[in-house]
Interface confidence: low
């Protein structure tokens, strides 16, 4: 903690400006009014304070707002956000998407820090659900965000938010997560026509049950091998040779290259050799 000392004569800061970078830590503590700092937080970012000086400014705000900063201050924290601890952030009530964007911008290009994770958690809990605009924002900054959530957390995602999800946002999701997301996606895209529906649902199919894959096989969708390889093994196993052939369209010819990998390997072992032979791919059950 910085020791309390009187501000030298003529040093009292009338506003937050560049002259403050020449202040020693104790002078900043003594000569900058916390309320003034709170109202002029937007200026702090434009001034090249040292990390030690930022520590002092944070301390002043902590004293002014022991129960947590108001959103008007949080929105303009800028680089001072990097000085916050998860414990500090847990005291905040962030409701504005603009505030969230401003703070995520500060951390842009870096991996998700504990501070950012806490901020997002507070924000989403404050909203009650992961709505489309929030998801749009979070996946723009952190493409892997969705897959970092637990299946329980994903259950709070409303189907309407699924429209914000891009294929790359699901790259690192495991089957348990896709099990939760797939039914939501199915609901979200239910009014689309066949080919458009398939384009949208494709990334989520790792959570699809057998009956949905059977239905897709009747719709001339031409699923590529990369998508097929991500399907649940238990969902693929009951499919007949004819259904897989219809499901993959021209890509059925690529099964040969994947015959030693799951789920293709396990599916092949479940089929009658006579049926496999009809594919003309030399697959051995």
């Amino acid at each position: 903690e910085v020791e309390k000392t009187a501000c030298p004569s003529g040093k009292k800061a009338p506003e937050i400006d560049e002259s403050l970078i020449f202040y020693k830590k104790w002078e900043l503590e003594a000569c900058v009014d916390a309320a003034l700092l709170a109202t002029q937080m937007d200026r702090v970012n434009a001034i090249p304070f040292t990390y030690e000086q930022l520590d002092v400014l944070k301390h002043k705000l902590d004293e002014l707002y022991p129960q947590g900063y108001p959103e008007s201050v949080i929105q303009h924290l800028g680089y001072l956000f990097l000085k916050m601890s998860p414990e500090d952030i847990r005291k905040w009530n962030v409701t504005s998407l603009e505030t969230l964007k401003a703070l995520l911008e500060v951390n842009k290009g870096h991996e998700m820090s504990p501070q950012v994770a806490t901020l997002i958690d507070r924000f989403v809990k404050g909203r009650g659900q992961l709505d489309k605009d929030t998801l749009d924002t979070l996946t723009a900054f952190y493409p892997g965000y969705l897959c970092s959530l637990s299946p329980e957390e994903l259950s709070s995602v409303p189907p309407s938010s699924i429209w914000a999800v891009r294929p790359q946002d699901l790259d690192t999701c495991d089957p348990r997560q896709l099990d939760v997301l797939y039914p939501k996606a199915r609901l979200a895209f239910q009014n689309m026509n066949g080919s458009e529906y398939f384009v949208k649902i494709q990334s989520f199919l790792g959570g699809a049950p057998t009956e949905d894959l059977k239905a897709l096989s009747q719709q001339n969708v031409s699923m590529d091998l990369a998508t097929f390889m991500k399907l649940r093994t238990d969902a693929v196993l009951p499919l007949t040779v004819a259904e897989v052939q219809k499901l993959l369209g021209p890509h059925v010819e690529g099964l040969k290259a994947e015959e030693r990998h799951r789920p293709v390997r396990d599916w092949i072992l479940r089929q009658r050799q006579d049926d496999l032979d009809t594919l003309g791919l030399g697959l051995q059950g």
Partner: antibody
Framework: QVQLQQPGTELVKPGASVKLSCKAS????????MHWVKQRPGQGLEWIGN????????NYNEKIKNKATLTVDKSSSTAYMQLSSLTSEDSAVYYC?????????????WGQGTTLTVSS | DIVMTQSQKFMSTTVGDRVSITCKAS??????VAWYQQKPGQSPKLLIY???NRYTGVPDRFTGSGSGTDFTLTISNMQSEDLADYFC?????????FGAGTKLELK
């Protein structure tokens, strides 16, 4: 080595039918699907359809579905395409091409093409 | 049907040039795109498959790139034997479709 042999030319009258052949050698005929492609003089390539030589299963381009019929004779390792109700629009070079799913390549071997001329 | 558009029907080039031929798909085809070379009186020859993989025996001056809807075939050091028609093809879904072709000519 892999070869797909096609007759050089066919001359037929409008309204007639013709059966083009494609004899495969140098590989296991039933292990690779055979596709047929049309090319009109100075034009691009148009996919007609494909056939699975193992069981005769086919896929056709819907635009020209009623024009072509694909068949195979496994005993002679030959693929056939019958074209019916011929008009001058059907005058073109017709290629057979093998699809190699083992390496997930598309058409790795093509026949030399049969030039079909429809004229009275 | 997926339309493959090769906007340049002809391209003039000289030996040693770097030539880029483009192809645009009307919808997302991932990387299921091949490039073929065709010389007069001959059948097409496979150059590139899966958008960027060079087929066996194809000189390394030929490279493919792109995914989704935009694809490019690049010849880094144009040779006289490369004068030919070049076609792109999608094999993402039936019916398989080809571009109209780009003819490389000498300036």
């Amino acid at each position: 080595q892999v070869q797909l042999q096609q007759p050089g030319t066919e001359l037929v009258k409008p309204g007639a039918s013709v059966k083009l052949s494609c004899k495969a050698s140098g590989y296991t005929f039933t292990s690779y699907w055979m596709h047929w492609v049309k090319q009109r003089p100075g034009q691009g390539l148009e996919w007609i359809g494909n056939i699975n030589p193992s069981n005769g299963g086919t896929n056709y381009n819907e635009k020209i579905k009623n024009k072509a019929t694909l068949t195979v004779d496994k005993s002679s390792s030959t693929a056939y395409m019958q074209l019916s109700s011929l008009t001058s629009e059907d005058s073109a070079v017709y290629y057979c091409a093998r699809w190699n799913y083992y390496g997930n390549y598309p058409f790795d071997y093509w026949g030399q093409g049969t030039t079909l001329t429809v004229s009275s | 049907d997926i339309v493959m558009t090769q906007s340049q029907k002809f391209m003039s080039t000289t030996v040693g040039d770097r030539v880029s031929i483009t192809c645009k798909a009307s919808q997302n085809v991932g990387t299921a795109v091949a490039w073929y070379q065709q010389k007069p009186g001959q059948s097409p020859k496979l150059l590139i498959y899966s958008a960027s993989n060079r087929y066996t025996g194809v000189p390394d001056r030929f490279t493919g790139s792109g995914s989704g809807t935009d694809f490019t075939l690049t010849i880094s050091n144009m040779q006289s034997e490369d004068l030919a028609d070049y076609f792109c093809q999608q094999y993402s879904s039936y019916p398989l479709t080809f571009g109209a072709g780009t003819k490389l000519e000498l300036k």
